[in-house]
Interface confidence: low
């Protein structure tokens, strides 16, 4: 049942040992009790004991104290279990009867075997506290106490809330005095079925099947499932949502594995040359004077370009080159002549003409000869 009405008989006094009719019991009043619990009636009347009935064996003769039976067997206090919401009101009839023999059934007793009958009614809230009462008639006195308590797993003001503590797949909770659930540590939700994940575990990207756990949903990683997993094979990129591959600066391609900044990452140009990116994995080196090659790795000999004129010979130097001019010539490239037409500088029949700017003369060569002095034969 949802609750139990408990009646504790404490003392019955019948000093003269008489029945309700006034007739004495022979040899004494062997007293037992019948209890009837029913719904509230303004005037308690006969009829079915709608909340239950209970009777006792013979408890004593005439006047006696009733021993408390704390074994819980339902003997004293008497137990009247009920299986409904306690209404908060009741009627109670307690009859004391004389048992001339061993048969205590109503039909086996003479009608005048009644010693006394009390009837009370009123309000009674569920609670642990006993209500003490004493009812006195001209001949008898009965002292007793009563209360209503909830059965195991029933709670609330009317014992109407069923709550059974549990710690399994269907819930992890204990019951509060009002019947509400109180979740065990690490659990939440209406029936405490939902585990509380590791503190900080991402609400959307993480989940858990037991407290303090953080399991990641597909595409997420990290202790708190707040780091996305980039596209498989992403080399130089990151993600803001799973399976993305957003390239770092200087990288391109689907997997961010194509170098767009070869100059910075590899410094391919040598000897102080200037590097320019010109596409994926391509670059151009602009060499300083004196250097050549794709990466300006080759040092040039400046004499290779035959800078010395008029038969001057070229010599490489650390900072460039030097022309050794033949007699009659001078200048950086032996371009200036100290000769004039009077010195007959033109060979092979070349004709000499005086000049004013730069050189002092110029040779006009016959066919098949060239050079500033017609000194070279053209094959």
């Amino acid at each position: 049942g949802s609750g139990v009405f408990q009646l504790q008989l404490q003392e019955f006094i019948n000093e003269r040992g008489v029945l309700a009719s006034g007739r004495p019991c022979e040899p004494g009043c062997r007293t037992f009790f019948r209890v009837c619990l029913k719904h509230f009636q303004a005037v308690v009347s006969p009829g079915p004991c709608t909340f239950g009935t209970v009777s006792t064996p013979v408890l004593g003769t005439n006047s006696f104290a009733v021993r408390d039976d704390s074994s819980g067997g339902g003997r004293n206090p008497l137990q009247l279990p009920f299986n409904f919401t306690w209404p908060g009101t009741f009627s109670l009839i307690i009859e004391a009867w004389h048992a001339p023999g061993d048969d205590l059934r109503p039909e086996a007793l003479p009608p005048d075997a009644l010693i006394s009958k009390i009837a009370i009614q009123g309000s009674l809230a569920v609670g642990q506290n006993w209500l003490l009462d004493e009812q006195t008639s001209t001949l008898t006195r009965l002292r007793y106490s009563y209360r209503v308590i909830c059965s195991d797993n029933y709670y609330g003001d009317n014992c109407s809330r069923l709550c059974k503590k549990r710690n399994d797949h269907f819930g992890h909770y204990v019951c509060q005095p009002d019947g509400n659930l109180s979740c065990l540590p690490g659990w939440t939700g209406e029936y405490c079925q939902q585990p509380i994940c590791l503190s900080g575990c991402h609400e959307q990207n993480g989940y858990c099947s037991k407290p303090a756990e953080c399991l990641c949903r597909p595409g997420w990683q990290g202790r708190l499932c707040n780091e996305c997993i980039p596209h498989n094979g992403c080399r130089h990129g990151t993600c803001s949502t799973p399976w993305q591959c957003t390239c770092d600066e200087g990288w391109g391609g689907l997997f961010c594995d194509q170098d767009l900044n070869y100059c910075t990452h590899h410094s391919p140009c040598k000897n102080g040359a200037t590097c320019s990116n010109s596409g994926q994995r391509s670059y151009t080196c602009t060499c300083r004077p004196g250097y050549t090659g794709v990466d300006c790795e080759l040092e040039l000999s400046e004499c290779d370009s035959n800078p010395c004129r008029n038969g001057g010979s070229c010599k490489d130097q650390e900072d460039g080159y030097h022309c050794l001019c033949p007699p009659g010539y001078y200048g950086l490239h032996c371009e200036h002549s100290t000769l004039s037409c009077a010195d007959s500088p033109c060979f092979n029949g070349g004709s000499c003409r005086e000049r004013n700017q730069g050189a002092n003369y110029a040779c006009e060569c016959p066919p098949n000869f060239t050079g500033s002095n017609c000194e070279k034969k053209v094959d």
Partner: antibody, heavy 118, light 107 residues
Framework: EVQLVESGGGLVQPGGSLRLSCAAS????????ISWVRQAPGKGLEWVGL????????DYADSVKGRFTISADTSKNTAYLQMNSLRAEDTAVYYC???????????WGQGTLVTVSS | DIQMTQSPSSLSASVGDRVTITCRAS??????VAWYQQKPGKAPKLLIY???FLYSGVPSRFSGSGSGTDFTLTISSLQPEDFATYYC?????????FGQGTKVEIK
């Protein structure tokens, strides 16, 4: 003299319905509860359910809950057992009994046989 | 539901024997136990109520005892008319339950 007389038993097909009656006499019908108890052939006694004729409140064994309904007509001093969705395992002799002060059965009817078979 | 377990399920005895039948409840039922006698083709008859009280008209050779979970029906001197099946019943809860019965046969 206290008397309880059942009627209404018979053969019914599985899934069918039947209503049993229990006519009471010789005592105040509204001051007692009436219980129905059944006994399958060669088996023991099984409490089926009860009714408080005065209030109409009733209770049932788990095995029949939702299928059987107990009612009472106080003007006729008669209790009824309405049996629906009958099964082969409901085959039994059905007794009504007076459920006296303390919950024991001091008077019984003679019983009526219900056979559920196709 | 409270289960009532009776033992033995059957026994053979002779007229004049003392016979004891026991009934064990699956939980405490105070003294809310009754005993019944049933003969073939007949309705059960009440023998004992409230564990130990003899019902009106029942011979005094029948007696009952016990409280809590263990109960006993004793027939002090078996008579020919006592050969029958005996059932215990608990009425501690609204959902009354019976034991499975003990058949007392002639030896």
């Amino acid at each position: 003299e206290v008397q309880l007389v059942e009627s209404g038993g018979g053969l019914v097909q599985p899934g069918g319905s039947l209503r049993l009656s229990c006519a009471a006499s010789g005592f105040t019908f509204t001051d007692n509860w009436i219980s129905w108890v059944r006994q399958a052939p060669g088996k023991g006694l099984e409490w089926v359910g009860l009714i408080n004729p005065q209030s109409g409140s009733s209770d049932y064994a788990d095995s029949v809950k939702g299928r059987f309904t107990i009612s009472a007509d106080t003007s006729k001093n008669t209790a009824y057992l309405q049996m629906n969705s009958l099964r082969a395992e409901d085959t039994a002799v059905y007794y009504c009994a007076r459920d006296n002060f303390g919950g024991y059965f001091d008077y019984w009817g003679q019983g009526t046989l219900v056979t559920v078979s196709s | 539901d409270i289960q009532m377990t009776q033992s033995p399920s059957s026994l053979s005895a002779s007229v004049g024997d003392r016979v004891t039948i026991t009934c064990r409840a699956s939980q405490d039922v105070s003294t809310a136990v009754a005993w019944y006698q049933q003969k073939p083709g007949k309705a059960p008859k009440l023998l004992i109520y409230s564990a130990s009280f003899l019902y009106s008209g029942v011979p005094s050779r029948f007696s009952g005892s016990g409280s809590g979970t263990d109960f006993t029906l004793t027939i002090s001197s078996l008579q020919p008319e006592d050969f029958a099946t005996y059932y215990c019943q608990q009425s501690y809860t609204g959902q009354s339950t019976f034991g499975q019965g003990t058949k007392v046969e002639i030896k």
